[in-house]
């Protein structure tokens, strides 16, 4: 009986073994097929049309103080994707802004030569003819046009003729509006931060990138104007002039923007000097915005050479005056505040000069001169509070000029002398002009570059003009690098696990089954 009993249990065991092995085989087979298909699908989707057809684009930013040339590069077959365009080169043109060439337009061609030749070197010759070139002029040229449309037009005409001589696909030179400058700056930083992407990200490669798709506001400071652009909480605007509507990648954005002409750092300084010299008792201007011991002679004719100082213009009993620095942050701050008229506001809330400003919302990227100045002062860290920034500015401005010159021997004196004013101006503009507070200060991120591309309006301008920002989300969005890596690793692991289990099943003795049953 015992033998019969043993035989029956052996049969049962054999049946169970067969049953289990069949099921496990089926499961393993199915899993491995799925994993292989998934790996192939992910691999093929990600690496479709592999021969990399690279495209290039050139944008010249003709600012008030200088001109910069930017070269961008992107894979042709991915040009509607988010974040695929990146900057490969920046070339700073030697000399002032193009508006300064109004009396010597014949020199513009030579002025642009070096950077255009650099573009010729960087971009492969085979790509030259299909590389678009755009020149956008900003507030310096807006100011010149206020004086004379013909003068501004003449400068642009010579610029166009010069740029047409190169082998690229020249697309024109124009003065962009303040609204465009603000909007394109906003597009640039949000494009680079991946805010227009609808993909879920497992990890972030961009330091300021958050997992949510809330866009960043843009704060841009130039030499002659400053722009503020963001998506406010309340979508209804009191001032249609400041409202923009975009549809980008299938999502609607209602954006507030304003450009304050004459409130760039250079023109703000001219305004301040013109205002302060009105009350000077003689040809000496004791200025708290310059370091103690600093001296500089200014021609009155230069002071009034800009439409920005018109409101302070008066006849002075001297042709020149001398700035004598006294280095006092608090007094400098008070002097700067007088440039902002906050007594008049026809809206529920204003920035200054009667310009509507909705309540601030979200994080802001502060770039261009906001970044350059704060970076020089070593105040761009996220950890530095507004109180600390003010404290550092007080300390910096009070340092004697001779000491400053020694500490920063490599910096041009013209620029070095103005950091006290510029830093103070930035604080005043952000706090009193735009109503940031000590608490909301932490929402300001001083940004120079994002993933190697300069923050500024030029990239957004090119993306728009080359139709690389679709209104609708592209149908088949290729995976982000992080998603691709994650899926490849996941399905590879599935295959490895399947293989290990398979090996264990078919190379283990029968007691393995006893343990399992």
């Amino acid at each position: 009986m015992k033998g019969t009993k043993d035989l029956t249990s052996q049969q049962k065991e054999s049946n169970v073994k067969t049953f289990c092995s069949k099921n496990i085989l089926a499961i393993l087979g199915f899993s491995s097929i799925i994993a292989v298909i998934a790996l192939l699908a992910v691999g093929l989707t990600q690496n479709k049309a592999l021969p990399e057809n690279i495209k290039y684009g050139i944008v010249l930013d003709a600012g008030s103080s200088h001109t910069s040339l930017y070269i961008y590069k992107w894979p042709a077959e991915k040009e509607n994707d988010t974040g695929v365009v990146h900057q490969v080169e920046e070339c700073r043109v030697k000399g002032p802004g193009i508006s300064k060439y109004v009396q010597k337009v014949n020199e513009i061609g030579i002025y642009l030569t070096d950077c255009m030749e650099r573009a010729r070197e960087v971009i492969p010759r085979s790509q030259h003819q299909e590389t678009p070139v755009y020149l956008g002029a900003t507030a310096g040229m807006r100011l010149l046009r206020m004086e004379s449309e013909e003068l501004a037009d003449r400068v642009l005409d010579v610029v166009e003729r010069s740029l047409s001589n190169y082998p690229f696909d020249f697309q024109g030179a124009r003065i962009i509006t303040g609204q465009e400058e603000g909007a394109y700056g906003w597009i640039t930083i949000n494009y680079l931060l991946g805010k227009f992407s609808q993909k879920t990200r497992w990890f972030s490669i961009v330091p300021y990138e958050t997992n949510n798709q809330e866009t960043f506001g843009a704060l841009d400071l130039g030499g002659a104007s400053t722009q503020i652009t963001f998506v406010p909480q309340n979508q209804t605007t009191e001032s249609p002039d400041n409202a923009l509507q975009f549809r980008l990648y299938g999502k609607d954005y209602n954006v507030y923007t304003h450009s304050f002409l004459c409130y760039g750092k250079d023109q703000a300084l001219w305004q301040k000097l013109a205002k302060d010299i009105q009350v000077a008792s003689n040809e000496i201007l004791r200025d708290p915005c310059f370091h103690p011991g600093y001296k500089k002679v200014v021609n009155v004719s230069d002071l009034y050479k800009t439409p920005c100082t018109k409101r302070f213009e008066m006849t002075l009993p001297f042709q020149q005056f001398e700035i004598q620095g006294i280095g006092n942050y608090q007094q400098c701050h008070q002097s700067v505040l007088e440039l902002f008229n906050t007594s008049y506001c026809p809206y529920s809330q204003c920035a200054f000069n009667g310009i509507f400003l909705p309540p601030l919302q979200g994080d802001f990227g502060a770039f261009s001169a906001f970044y350059f100045v704060m970076n020089f002062l070593n105040l761009t860290s996220e950890k530095v509070s507004q109180e600390k920034v003010t404290e550092m500015m007080k300390k910096f401005c009070s340092q004697p000029w001779e000491e400053i010159k020694t500490s920063y021997a490599g910096v041009k004196e013209k620029y070095l002398s103005e950091y006290c004013f510029s830093g103070t101006y930035i604080l005043s503009l952000l706090l009193q002009g735009y109503h940031f507070t000590a608490d909301s200060w932490e929402h300001i991120h001083f940004i120079g570059k994002i993933q190697g591309s300069d923050a500024g309006w030029t990239l957004g301008y090119m993306l728009n003009l080359t139709n690389m920002i679709p209104a609708e989300q592209p149908l088949s969005t290729p995976l982000s690098h992080s998603t691709y890596v994650f899926l490849m690793v996941l399905f590879s692991l599935v295959l490895v696990i399947v293989a290990i289990i398979g090996l264990l099943i078919f190379h283990k003795p029968s007691y393995f089954w006893k343990d399992m049953v």
């Epitope: 109004v102 009396q103 010149l144 046009r145 206020m146 004086e147 004379s148 449309e149 013909e150 003068l151 501004a152 037009d153 003449r154 004719s301 009034y304 050479k305 800009t306 439409p307 018109k310 213009e313």
Partner: antibody, heavy 123, light 106 residues
């Protein structure tokens, strides 16, 4: 209303100097570019010199370059033309003229003119 | 410099008729062309600015057209007060005037 009144004309010997003035009223003087245009007896109009609103651009006709100087005093709402090394061919009625505007932008055309002041260069 | 050539030098027209005055620039001046009227013993008066814009206070019978190098001033129905000398002026380069067209009573 806009008014431009020239003064300072007269008879002067060749090689000598003369200063013309143009008193402006009825508009914000420092917001506009100003010009001198002349007209020789029985002849057409000839532009002489321009001074843009913010002194960004000061320009002269080749015929007067190096001899004439345009200037302005915004506190006095006055435009000047300092003429030196005068020649017989400088004899003309000298008009003061204001730059026009294209909307918010300045324009190099002349929307208001004074009645002119006669300058005669003769020995 | 940009040379402006006006034609004809003299134009004889009867009141109520249409008058067409031409101005040619030696090089392209975009639309920076302006027209003035001058009567004997008076200062010039702006009629048209930037090729086709009517200056304030100027009757609608005056109109301007053209761009580049060829420009036209048209007076649709001549009135007695329209008989005068007409000048064109370009402002693309430093200002230059045409030699004038004398519009006289036929």
């Amino acid at each position: 209303q806009v008014q431009l009144v020239e003064s300072g004309g007269g008879v002067v010997q060749p090689g000598r100097s003369l200063r013309l003035s143009c008193a402006a009223s009825g508009f914000t003087f420092n917001n506009y570019g100003m010009n001198w245009v002349r007209q020789a007896p029985g002849k057409g109009l000839e532009w002489v010199a321009s001074f843009s609103s913010s002194s960004t651009y000061i320009s002269y006709a080749d015929t007067v370059k190096g001899r004439f100087t345009i200037s302005r005093d915004n506190s006095k709402n006055t435009l000047y033309l300092q003429m030196s090394s005068l020649r017989a061919e400088d004899t003309a009625v000298y008009y003061c003229a204001r730059h026009g505007r294209y909307g918010g932008y300045g324009g190099f055309y002349f929307d208001y003119w004074g009645q002119g002041t006669m300058v005669t260069v003769s020995s | 410099e940009t040379v402006m050539t006006q034609s004809p030098a003299t134009l004889s027209v009867s009141p109520g008729e249409r008058a067409t005055l031409s101005c040619r620039a030696s090089e392209g001046v975009k639309s920076y062309m302006h027209w003035y009227q001058q009567k004997p013993g008076q200062a010039p008066r702006l009629l048209i600015y930037k090729a086709s814009n009517l200056a304030s206070g100027i009757p609608a019978r005056f109109s301007g057209s053209g761009s580049g190098t060829e420009f036209t001033l048209t007076i649709s129905s001549l009135q007695s007060e329209d008989f005068a000398v007409y000048y064109c002026q370009q402002s693309w380069n430093d200002p230059t005037f045409g030699q004038g067209t004398k519009l006289e009573l036929k």
